[in-house]
């Protein structure tokens, strides 16, 4: 960068190289240059020449100020005119950044997603810094007193196999950087406690024409845990409010789940669990469409959801897509 | 200018307790853990623990734990160490320096020389 | 604990040549490493934090570099100056602990 150039002289910003976005500072530049006593001093801002708000303060020095500065980043320079040579003298170049201190870390959230092999640590770091924030991810055992610190710039992946104190955690955020520093409250956790089992997944569906036709929904989850509790939701494509029905799963053999829907509409499906009893929910599913027929029996497979327009199918599924108006992963 | 302004040399007795300041300016004092390191003559540095001004949580390596007590005052920007039972075997220099996750230790205090001698 | 084992302990250069510092750390540290100076009588000083990233203020002839449990610590054309004990310090379980230091002797 620029701060890497041979300088003849020197150039300071006031307060900091790196201050609060929207604060008034001043950039000095003191030459320093062999057999020459600058006409002038010039600055220059990402290469471009300032023409306003230059000072000189003595034979050698010159200040420009700026009033509310908002850029994130400059590279400022500045050179020196002098006697009998044609060319302008770079003096020296410096780096300068705005931004702000970071909040205070907050909503943080930590997951093991069964058979990841980690615990996934989350939180919210509130407004934008603009500036290098650090953040380190304090993991405090409750049995040892032994302090982890995970340095990260977003989330964290923690293997549990380093998770040696124990089952009972401590864990706090601290968020820095050249402005100020903020912790979070402290997460007490509990590893049994935190463990969100295998995606379930919406494998096929059928609609049987029954006297009041039917429609079975197929559904699967890998995982190990014994007692699960699952949620499924679905609605119209056409309608803004989805149906919940909730179920206890015991995930031995694939779930089959009974919905009486109207005739010829498209619907949407997701599923999600938890460990029952337990805080946190798995992400919804991604979105399953089954459109039930006007009379016909009709099977909807998870291997016809992707683009099957021109199949000759009677059912034309969309690929997964966005047409929930919550499909956050509810984790809290 | 940062500054980490230690309190003087102690000469205690065995048995006794000490307790050494450790004085900060030229930053924001709750931004930064205050860390404690004993260095013994001729030896490397050893970790105390680290105070956080902002909340008072505390870290401390298990060998310090029951010989040392972190505090800090914050309207006079002043972190403490008091050490207690002490014996030959804690005669060293104690050092105070400020870190957080975006600096690190990044200045340190003069030190304070503690001498245990009957 | 993690134990940092430094090497080599003494280290004896003339100027102008470029030397290594090797910390070795017992288990995987995730650059979670900090490297210092200390002089005769003085207060250890921060040259690089978090394995290689560089300090306002030290002369960029200390660069450090390294990860998972391998780090070193370069001085590029050493100056007579650069005399002292060098420390590393690992930041990522606690207890932190340091190195037992690497003397450096100028010639």
């Known amino acids: 960068g620029i701060t890497n150039i041979n300088c003849s002289g020197h150039i300071w910003v006031e307060p900091a190289t790196i201050f609060k976005m929207g604060m008034n500072i001043s950039i000095y530049c003191q030459a320093a240059i062999k057999n020459c006593q600058p006409r002038k001093l010039h600055f220059y801002k990402n290469g471009i020449k300032e023409r306003f708000q230059i000072t000189r303060i003595n034979k050698t020095t010159a200040r420009l100020w700026y009033k509310n500065f908002l850029e994130p980043h400059a590279s400022m320079y500045c050179t020196a005119e002098c006697p009998k040579h044609f060319q302008e003298t770079l003096i020296c170049g410096k780096d300068i950044s705005s931004g702000y201190p970071p909040d205070i870390p907050d909503e943080v959230t930590c997951v093991i997603y069964e058979y990841s092999g980690n615990m996934t640590c989350t939180w919210n770091a509130g407004k934008l810094t603009y500036i290098d924030t650090k953040y380190v991810v304090h993991v405090k055992s409750l049995e040892t007193e032994e302090e982890q610190q995970y340095l990260t710039s977003s989330y964290i992946n923690i293997s549990t196999d380093s998770l040696q104190g124990g089952k009972k955690y401590l864990v706090w955020v601290q968020a820095a950087n050249a402005l100020g520093m903020e912790e979070s409250k402290q997460l007490q956790i509990h590893l049994d406690d935190i463990v969100i089992p295998s995606a379930a997944v919406i494998s096929r569906a059928e609609t049987i024409n029954a006297t009041v036709p039917k429609t079975i929904i197929y559904w699967d989850s890998q995982t190990t845990i014994e007692k699960v509790s699952c949620e499924m939701r679905y609605k119209a494509t056409t309608n803004q409010t989805w149906n919940v029905k909730e179920f206890d799963t015991n995930f031995t053999y694939v779930q089959q789940s009974e919905f009486y829907l109207e005739p010829n509409i498209k619907y949407v499906f997701q599923v999600r669990c938890q460990e029952t009893g337990k805080r946190y929910w798995q992400p919804w599913s991604s979105l399953f469409f089954h459109k039930t027929p006007e009379t016909v029996p009709q099977v909807t497979s998870k291997a016809f959801q992707h683009d099957t327009w021109n199949s000759g199918l009677t059912v034309a599924s969309i690929s997964t897509g966005h047409l929930t108006s919550d499909n956050r992963g509810d984790i809290g | 200018e940062v500054q980490l302004q230690q309190s003087g040399p102690e000469l205690v007795k065995p048995g006794a307790s000490v307790k050494m300041s450790c004085k900060a300016s030229?930053?924001?004092?709750?931004?930064?853990?205050m860390n404690w390191m004993k260095q013994s003559h001729g030896k490397s540095l050893e970790w105390i623990g680290y105070i956080s001004p902002k909340n008072g949580r505390t870290g401390y390596n298990q060998k310090f734990k029951g010989k040392a007590t972190l505090t800090v005052d914050k309207s006079s920007t002043t972190a403490y160490m008091e050490l207690r039972s002490l014996t030959s075997e804690d005669s060293a220099v104690y050092y105070c320096?400020?870190?957080?996750?975006?600096?690190?230790?990044?200045?340190w205090g003069q030190g304070t020389t503690v001498t245990v001698s009957s | 604990d993690i134990v940092l084992t430094q090497s080599p302990a003494t280290l004896c250069v003339t100027p102008g040549e470029t030397v290594s510092l090797s910390c070795r750390a017992s288990q995987n540290i995730y650059k979670n490493l900090h490297w210092f100076q200390q002089k005769s009588h003085r207060s250890p000083r921060l040259l690089i934090k978090y394995a290689s990233d560089s300090i306002s203020g030290i002369p960029s002839r200390f660069t450090g570099s390294g990860s998972g449990t391998d780090y070193t610590l370069s001085i590029n054309s050493v100056k007579p100056e650069d005399e002292g004990i060098y420390y590393c310090?690992?930041?990522?379980?606690?207890?932190?602990?340091f190195g037992g230091g690497t003397k450096l002797e100028i010639k």
């Open positions: 320096a400020k870190s957080n996750g975006y600096y690190a230790l990044d200045y």
């Open positions: 030229g930053y924001t004092f709750t931004d930064y853990y």
């Open positions: 310090l690992q930041g990522y379980s606690t207890p932190w602990t």
